[in-house]
């Protein structure tokens, strides 16, 4: 069963509000930039359900169970035509290169998920990096909108390279390090 | 007086290396793209005073300082005629606008040192950055030629953008160092 | 030595507000997040958000959003943890804590020694 | 969020090694490798042990390691030290609007 939730009958937030629980998800659509899901709520019937902002939510399990059937569904529905979704629509006159059309052909082919720069969004700025994953990777915040993802810094280097720049300059401190600074991996100083 | 800093006598760095003190920096020079310090030893004789590779050093202070002398030395230069390098008249592919030959035709008529993109070089690698001047500066490398200059971080940000991207992700060391070397904020060892 | 110094315990009554402090020294305050995490008596730890000073550009816990106010005045190297209006609920411990890398994504490797608020009629 | 799961106590004799495990799901742990672990003793702020899945701060003892499989993530502590005995947590990314998970923690008592 799903985890208690918010529900945001109206976008007030009072002190008070009461909690229910999602009994399941039902649908995704992305509105401005922001993914929604269609929740059915437990205890009340279909006619109450609600299509909720992902960052109100506290269901991830359910969230991730909804996102493997979508996947497949989806998958299933390549081969059909389809009314391009508003979110596919969308144009933006962020970067609109070759490769761009290229990769939104092959996602309009294959219904996947946008992710990253796929999304169309224009990044804002990086709020984070990692190379836990074995490529180094930057956390995108996108303008309008408070959702951020995972992208390849390859690719951010190449897309916007202005605010990788920009990331790097408010981040980067340039102290020397101790000589017993450990590993030493990256050496040559690098201070 | 300056920092501790390992004397590289050879460049195989044992284990139990002694630890030597900076008195000050008399001179500098890029020797295959990799700037250098003349060092005077604390409590040794001038005659051995020895040329260190700028990543091994930990006395920013003293660099800092003799910087200083060393470009009002070099603005003294200014005015004297003198042989164009090879440097300069070698062409460049990599930029040719208009912009460009405009401030080579005012550079031609006021005799003046080209100094940074101004030389007309293709940029190879940043090998070290400073903002002991206020703004950031790059210490840049260009293609084709062992000397190096300094370049402002805002304009090379723009020129080439790739080249600044590379030099900051060297620089990001993925372990964590111990906490005396923080402080330091944007210190100006800057690599 | 990076410190982070939080402001003192507190004691308050239900529905009165309440702002307390986490002063930030030995590094450059604005290239790090600042998160807030709070742990209630005998009980885990639980995040609550993060702010970064350079703008002021915060993430919430949905658990919290709504609840608490973030925010940071960098001129003074200062975040802020703030309630409008407080609950018996919202007695904890409540921790500062500073990035170990200015690009650290979700981990803290700095702490504050932590602010006690008791909320008590 | 939902916290992640972890065991409510473990124990072990000093010299011996013992693991903890943290246990999320595909929006958390499976998705990224992003998972922190803690060691808090009474009275105590916490202190960072392990980041980004096996990474270790300087000062930490290569006693401790981390690691993890599919949705789970876990610490392991060697040759177990009295001055081990703490509460561990284990802390994940979980995406924008979550951000960050805690788990519940885990009480770590050295024996005799």
């Known amino acids: 069963m799903g985890k208690k939730t918010k529900r945001t009958a109206d976008s007030s937030s009072s002190e008070d509000e009461e909690e229910y629980v999602v009994e399941k998800v039902l649908d995704r659509r992305v509105v401005k930039g922001q993914v929604e899901y269609l929740l059915k709520w437990k205890g009340f019937s279909e006619e109450h359900n609600t299509w909720e902002p992902e960052k109100n939510l506290d269901c991830p399990e359910l969230i991730s169970e909804f996102m493997k059937k979508y996947k497949k569904m989806k998958e299933g529905e390549n081969n059909k035509p389809r009314e391009k979704s508003e979110s596919n629509k969308r144009k933006s006159n962020f970067s609109n290169s070759a490769d761009d059309i290229k990769s939104k052909k092959k996602r309009e082919q294959s219904n996947d998920i946008a992710r990253g720069f796929e999304r169309g969004l224009e990044p804002e700025k990086i709020i984070g990096a990692t190379d836990s994953c074995g490529d180094l990777m930057f956390l995108m915040k996108w303008k309008d909108t408070d959702e951020a993802d995972l992208v390849l810094a390859k690719e951010a280097n190449v897309k916007c390279p202005q605010i990788v720049i920009a990331f790097y300059e408010e981040r980067l401190t340039w102290h020397a390090y101790p000589e017993d600074a450990e590993n030493k991996e990256k050496e040559t100083a690098k201070s | 007086m300056g920092k501790k800093t390992k004397r590289t006598a050879d460049s195989s760095s044992s284990e139990d290396e002694e630890e030597y003190v900076v008195e000050k920096v008399l001179d500098r020079r890029v020797v295959k793209g990799q700037v250098e310090y003349l060092l005077k030893w604390k409590g040794f004789s001038e005659e051995h005073n020895t040329w260190e590779p700028e990543k091994n050093l930990d006395c920013p202070e003293l660099i800092s300082e003799f910087m200083k002398k060393y470009k009002k030395m070099k603005e003294g230069e200014n005015n004297k005629p003198r042989e164009k390098s090879e440097s300069n008249k070698r062409k460049s592919n990599f930029s040719n606008s208009a912009d460009d030959i405009k401030s080579k035709k005012k550079r031609e008529q006021s005799n003046d040192i080209a100094r940074g993109f101004e030389r007309g070089l293709e940029p190879e690698k940043i090998i070290g950055a400073t903002d002991s001047c206020g703004d950031l500066m790059f210490l840049m490398k260009w293609k084709d030629t062992d000397e190096a200059d300094l370049v402002l971080a805002k304009e090379a940000n723009v020129k080439c953008p790739q080249i600044v991207i590379a030099f900051y992700e060297e620089r990001l060391t993925w372990h964590a160092y111990p906490e005396d070397a923080e402080n330091k904020e944007k210190e100006t060892a800057k690599s | 030595a990076v410190q982070l110094v939080q402001s003192g315990a507190e004691v308050k009554k239900p529905g009165e507000s309440l702002r307390i402090s986490c002063k930030g020294s030995?590094?450059?305050?604005?290239?790090?997040?600042i998160s807030w995490v709070r742990q209630m008596p005998g009980k885990g730890l639980e995040w609550m958000g993060r702010?970064?000073?350079?703008?002021?550009?915060?993430n919430y816990s949905p658990s919290f959003q709504g609840h608490v106010t973030i925010s940071a005045d960098k001129s003074i190297s200062t975040a802020y943890l703030q309630w409008s209006s407080l609950k018996t609920s919202d007695t904890a411990m409540y921790y500062c804590a500073r990035p170990l890398q200015t690009y650290s994504i979700a981990s803290v490797g700095h702490w504050g020694q932590g602010t006690l608020v008791t909320v008590s009629s | 969020a939902s916290a992640l799961t972890q065991p409510a106590s473990v124990s072990g004799s000093p010299g011996q090694s013992i693991t903890i495990s943290c246990t999320g799901t595909?929006?958390?742990?499976?998705?990224?490798?992003?998972v922190s672990w803690y060691q808090q003793h009474p009275g105590k702020a916490p202190k960072l042990m392990i980041y980004?899945?096996?990474k270790r701060p300087s000062g930490v003892s290569n006693r401790f390691s981390g690691s993890k499989s599919g949705n789970t993530a876990s610490l392991t502590i060697s040759g177990l030290q009295a001055e081990d005995e703490a509460d561990y947590y284990c802390?994940?990314?979980?995406?924008?609007?979550?951000?960050?998970?805690f788990g519940g923690g885990t009480k770590l008592t050295v024996l005799g």
């Open positions: 802390c994940s990314y979980a995406g924008s609007s979550t951000f960050a998970v």
């Open positions: 980004e899945g096996s």
């Open positions: 702010i970064d000073p350079s703008d002021s550009y915060t």
């Open positions: 030995g590094y450059s305050f604005t290239s790090y997040w």
């Open positions: 595909s929006s958390d742990v499976g998705s990224y490798n992003l």
